[in-house]
């Protein structure tokens, strides 16, 4: 028999620096989680600890805080080229700066193989991305070799900017090619490392012949076996079993996500490939493990430019945006506007001559928007006004909900209106008027959406067994502010870009901006 | 572009060894393979034996096993083969080329001329 | 060890032609076969891997075919620049091993 460990990581999202548990801003350094120097004390740790090791990312390393935004990847290539990372699949984020946004800093500069088998070039691309990433690689592992065959979601055209001279293909439908050559190779002992769910890591488990072990990304799932050493709940156990259809146990795992914790999984493989035994879990990188010295370091050298960056400005406003929360909880604020246009400029993707956009409606609840943004001082915006307005460091995710579940929101949204109360939802693609003389939970009597099937974009009435997107924040596509029912009903949910970045780039492309209040929000005479 | 630039030819005496050099870049080094392969005169290609840059894992030809040695420096992007107890039978072109996997050469060296004589 | 055969050590053809090089494996070897073109004087260059992919930068002229033991590199509309020597070689089990090679002349 022959062990094999496999360290792996996933969705870590720019978290270079230390993170609180909840994964935001590091404040009480004797609490603070994850960052590149504590990983690399654990990672080192292992290493000489057991003989054959791989360290493996699924993904989305883009994407999440002020690293990203000032760096743009190439922090990315530094730290993961200084960890000795073996391989890396592609996430969706990866694609967010465009093609050209992956290849130099990261296809160019990574020092490991970087993994897709499903996603094709075509055109002028293909011969310059040819050879930058991989549908596979074969890795000497000691005495022995592991295939490691990568993949990423196919939802990536709509989640990320890819461009039109890549063609994302069916997971499964791509990954068996590649897995037959390597078996042709006489490799035995093949890893799929992709960024596609976990839904869809299951489906690989089950219908891909020939993977052993599958190590994925994309929906932040936490596994574990026995009691969870912090606030995540596990959706199953680590290593999640899937009963393959040739009738193999594959192990599947997926390390939560922010590199919070490290995942750690020991396989056992017979002389032919077989897996006899699969065990771990993913280690927390709280403080009991101290951080590496040297790259800490490197760290700090890195950090300065970011300080820099958070001063200077972003573009300018000529009105004053009303971030306050006397606004934003109890009417339409232009603060709300603009976060809500910027969120669906951000999504803005071509992919289908039949819609003018995929997705043209945005949700936010007001209780999200912490600060006003004063036009008097010049009318500049820098980073660090919008880090006021923004301070939890969420995403701004892509979410399918029914239209049913879109009434119960807006009810929701005023279910106890007049108590400042953070619920009550900034929109944009939507028009809502409320009745507040009705009852709760029937007080929405209009609400009309903005189509996207249409050439000139009007607004229609909800439909309530339609499907929509909607852009929102994080905090709401997991049920907070007491929006349970979109987290009980939704049909899928992406993560997309860090908020403060979304706006941020929307600022800088607009140079001069001006939100109004637009009557997006109205109350029917007599009752406000 | 990636390009692989061999020593310059060597004329030895029987018996002796000669290390032969593989100057690399515009590719990730540490991720790849490099193979040596030698080709006499108006015949055919055999391989030698491949190194994994990244680990210095390696794989022979059995054929090859007393004959070559292949190492790399990671620090200079450089892979080497030393060829030992020569006699004429090694003379020949010797090339370096890179593969990713255990598949194709994409890359080749310009190779370099080895002549064993008294 | 695999023995590839190339049946035939040369090739005539004419520019505009249409010409197919054979290769043959002693045993079955999937589609793990590639073919390279070897100009006088200079290293081999890479035309098709996995028995039919031509890589990047190759003209469409160049197609390659075949599996399990018997593999076949088209040449459709010759040009003079494709006077080289052409060598297949199998990696589907060590050693690898190449082919005699198959030196096309231009009439």
């Known amino acids: 028999a022959w062990e094999l460990t496999i360290l792996h990581t996933n969705d870590v999202h720019s978290r270079l620096e230390q993170t609180s548990e909840d994964s935001s801003k590091c404040v009480n350094a004797s609490r603070c989680m994850g960052g590149v120097a504590r990983l690399f004390t654990k990672v080192q740790q292992i290493r000489r600890a057991e003989p054959n090791v791989l360290l493996l990312d699924a993904g989305d390393q883009y994407q999440g805080t002020i690293w990203f935004t000032v760096y743009k990847g190439a922090e990315v290539a530094h730290f993961m080229n200084a960890l000795r990372y073996d391989a890396m699949a592609l996430g969706n984020h990866e694609f967010d700066n465009g093609v050209e946004g992956l290849i130099e800093p990261l296809l160019k500069e990574a020092k490991f193989p970087i993994l897709s088998a499903n996603i094709k070039a075509k055109g002028p691309l293909a011969s310059q991305i040819s050879g930058l990433y991989l549908p596979y690689k074969v890795l000497p592992v000691g005495d022995e070799v592991v295939g490691i065959v990568g993949y990423t979601s196919k939802e990536t055209p709509f989640l990320s900017n890819p461009g039109t001279n890549l063609v994302f293909e069916d997971e499964i439908t791509a990954l068996q090619p590649e897995v037959d050559k390597l078996k042709t190779l006489n490799v035995n002992k093949i890893i799929a490392l992709g960024h596609s769910g976990f839904e869809m890591d299951k489906l690989i488990a089950q219908k891909v012949r020939g993977v052993d072990v599958v190590v994925g990304g994309h929906s932040n799932t936490f596994l574990y076996t026995g009691n969870p050493p912090s606030k995540e709940v596990p959706a199953g156990k680590y290593p999640f079993i899937v009963t393959s259809d040739d009738g193999r146990k594959v192990p599947v795992v997926q390390a939560y996500a922010f590199g919070k914790y490290l995942g750690y999984l020991k396989i056992e493989f017979d002389e032919r490939g077989n897996v006899i035994s699969s065990h771990g879990n993913p280690i927390l990188l709280n403080s009991s493990i101290p951080e590496d010295p040297s790259i800490k370091a490197d760290i700090n050298k890195w950090r300065i430019k970011l300080d820099n960056y958070s001063t200077q400005e972003l573009g300018k406003t000529i009105v004053y945006l009303d971030g306050s929360s006397q606004s934003c909880r109890f009417r339409e604020c232009n603060m709300g506007n603009l976060i809500c246009d910027a969120m669906i400029n951000n999504n803005l993707r071509h992919t289908d001559e039949m819609f003018w956009n995929h997705v043209s409606m945005c949700i936010l609840n007001g209780g999200g928007i912490r600060s006003p943004i004063d036009e008097r001082n010049n009318g500049t915006i820098t980073w660090e006004n919008l880090a006021a307005v923004l301070p939890f460091g969420g995403t701004f995710d892509l979410v399918q909900l029914k239209g049913s579940t879109l009434k119960k929101a807006f009810e929701h949204s005023v279910h106890r209106y007049g108590q400042s109360t953070g619920e009550f939802l900034q929109v944009g693609g939507i028009h809502v008027v409320y009745d507040l003389s009705r009852k709760p939970g029937d007080r929405v009597v209009k609400l009309d959406v903005l189509c996207t099937k249409c050439r000139v974009p009007s607004y229609d009435p909800l439909k309530m067994d339609e499907v929509y997107k909607v852009i929102l924040p994080n905090f709401l596509a997991n049920g907070g502010d007491g929006f349970q029912m979109i987290k009980d009903e939704l049909l899928r949910h992406d993560s997309g870009d860090q908020d403060i970045n979304v706006v941020s780039t929307y600022i800088s492309k607009m140079k001069v901006i001006y939100p109004a209040v637009e009557g997006r929000i109205k109350f029917s005479t007599g009752s406000h | 572009q990636g390009q692989m630039q061999q020593s310059g030819a060597e004329l030895v005496k029987p018996g002796t060894s000669v290390k032969l050099s593989c100057k690399t870049s515009?590719?990730?080094?540490?991720?790849?393979?490099i193979s040596w392969l030698k080709q006499r005169p108006r015949q055919s290609l055999e391989w030698i034996a491949w190194?994994?840059?990244?680990?210095?894992?390696?794989n022979y030809n059995q054929k090859f096993t007393d004959k070559a040695q292949v190492t790399v420096d990671t620090s200079s992007s450089t892979a080497y083969m030393q060829l030992s107890s020569l006699t004429s039978e090694d003379s020949a072109i010797y090339y370096c080329?890179?593969?990713?996997?255990?598949?194709?050469?994409?890359?080749w060296g310009q190779g370099t001329t080895l002549t064993v004589s008294s | 060890d695999i023995v590839m055969t190339q049946s035939h050590k040369f090739m005539s053809t004419s520019v505009g032609d249409r010409v197919s090089i054979t290769c043959k494996a002693s045993?079955?070897?999937?589609?793990?076969v590639v073919w390279y073109q070897q100009k006088p004087g200079q290293s081999p260059k890479l035309l098709i891997y996995?028995?039919?992919s031509r890589h990047t930068g190759v003209p469409d002229r160049f197609t390659g075919s075949g599996s399990g033991t018997d593999f076949t590199l088209t040449l459709t509309n010759v040009q003079s620049e494709d006077l080289a020597d052409y060598f297949c070689?199998?990696?589907?089990?060590?050693?690898?091993?190449f082919g005699g090679g198959t030196n096309l002349e231009i009439k």
């Open positions: 515009g590719f990730t080094f540490s991720s790849s393979y």
């Open positions: 045993q079955d070897v999937g589609t793990a």
């Open positions: 190194i994994y840059a990244g680990t210095g894992n390696t």
């Open positions: 080329a890179r593969h990713v996997n255990w598949d194709y050469f994409d890359y």
């Open positions: 996995w028995a039919s």
């Open positions: 070689q199998q990696y589907r089990s060590y050693p690898w091993t």
